[in-house]
């Protein structure tokens, strides 16, 4: 399992270090969930041909995961801290259904994606503290939230194994282009 | 092992468009940013640009108005172009894969030299 | 921009010194900075990211502190390889800036 945020295993022991900022642990905890996804993806790649899969298109275009897009306020042209801090919220509260739906996808790693389940969730508390317009944030209807899991759940082996393979690539690109963006906040 | 391959025109005259690509071997294209980083003879590391797969990019403000950063997914590789060349635009450049942090991994450096 | 400024531009130094750099942010940049080093006619190299976070296969010699604005390389007994030129580099907010560098010679 990956280190929990606060004891970076790459860190080299720093004496008298301050403590963290807000936006130093908010890094952490992102690092900490990125680190899951990595382990997690390793059991999905050793255990399908699906990190290669050519058809991998196809099966996106019925998932409707969270993107970043210019609009958005994440990117360097455009950057506007509000509506990017709005959008990364918002697109973690959606991921979040996906997140379930990875629950009982992995069978070594099982501990690892409630992991990064609960970071996951971690993170948006700290977010949401973090957030001066929490009105503008959209919370995914519960309802719509379980049809689609079950949705999920119904599919064939196969494209099971591709949703799984596209959460977790579409959630690190999510979480790397949102780190990036909290930076300059 | 991933390793970046870069290649280009090493000499232009100036107002001509400078234009190389940076292909990437061994290791996973969509996860990191692409950057361009020059460096003129015997001065410092200026950071030109970067590109996502996704074909999203961040520019250098003082370069912007000519430089454009472009991505070839199907065959992990991705381009600078750079127009109206200057005797300043004389540098090596440099492809790099920025991870979280820093750029960890670096192209070998392509010589542009524009003169007349 | 955020400007990047290292002291000392060059220094000379013995096998087995202690040699440090500093290098300051024009303004802050938590632990947001990564640190270089470059031989002639090669590419730069990642020697620590986050401030003081050891980038692996980098010998233990080097080591790396500060947050914030001010930031210190420490190389704690030079190595003959290690004669150089380092740089740092902010990634807080773009543009990406360098430092300009600081070149350890041979006394």
């Known amino acids: 399992a990956p280190v929990p945020p606060g004891e970076d295993s790459k860190d080299v022991a720093a004496p008298h270090r301050q403590p963290l900022t807000s936006s130093e642990r908010i890094d952490k905890q992102i690092r900490y969930i990125l680190d899951g996804i990595s382990a997690l993806r390793k059991e999905t790649c050793n255990k399908s041909n699906m990190c290669e899969s050519s058809k991998e298109a196809l099966a996106e275009n019925n998932l409707n995961l969270p993107k970043m897009a210019e609009k958005d306020g994440c990117f360097q042209s455009g950057f506007n801290e509000e509506t990017c801090l709005v959008k990364i919220i918002t697109g973690l509260l959606e991921f979040e259904v996906y997140l379930e739906y990875l629950q009982n996808r992995f069978e070594s790693s099982e501990e690892q994606a409630r992991a990064v389940q609960m970071s996951t969730k971690v993170l948006i508390q700290f977010l949401q503290k973090k957030a001066k317009n929490l009105d503008a944030i959209t919370t995914p209807d519960p309802t719509t939230n379980a049809s689609l899991l079950t949705k999920l759940q119904a599919q064939n082996q196969w494209l099971q194994d591709m949703t799984t393979h596209l959460i977790l690539r579409s959630f690190k690109e999510f979480l790397q282009s949102s780190l990036r963006a909290l930076r300059q906040m | 092992q991933v390793q970046l391959q870069q290649w280009g025109a090493g000499l232009l005259k100036p107002s001509e468009t400078l234009s190389l690509t940076c292909a990437v071997y061994g290791g996973s294209f969509r996860e990191y940013y692409w950057s361009w980083i020059r460096q003129p003879p015997g001065k410092g590391l200026e950071w030109i640009g970067e590109?996502?797969?996704?074909?999203?990019?961040n520019y250098n403000p003082s370069l912007k108005s000519r430089v454009t950063i472009s991505v070839d997914t199907s065959k992990n590789q991705f381009s600078l172009k750079l127009s109206s060349v200057t005797a300043a635009d004389t540098a090596v450049y440099y492809c790099a894969r920025e991870e979280l942090d820093d750029f960890d991994i670096w192209g070998q450096g392509t010589m542009v030299t524009v003169s007349s | 921009d955020i400007q990047m400024t290292q002291s000392p531009s060059s220094l000379s130094a013995s096998v087995g010194d202690r040699v440090t750099i500093t290098c300051r942010a024009s303004q802050g940049i938590s632990s947001w900075l990564a640190w270089y080093q470059q031989k002639p006619e090669k590419a730069p190299k990642s020697l620590i990211y986050?401030?003081?976070s050891l980038q692996s296969g980098v010998p233990s010699r080097f080591s790396g502190s500060g947050s914030g604005t001010d930031f210190t390389l420490t190389i704690s007994s030079l190595q003959p390889e290690d004669f150089a030129t380092y740089y740092c580099?902010?990634?807080?907010?773009?543009?990406?800036?360098f430092g300009q560098g600081t070149k350890v010679e041979i006394k």
């Open positions: 580099q902010q990634y807080k907010s773009y543009p990406r800036t």
């Open positions: 986050a401030a003081s």
């Open positions: 590109i996502f797969h996704s074909g999203s990019t």
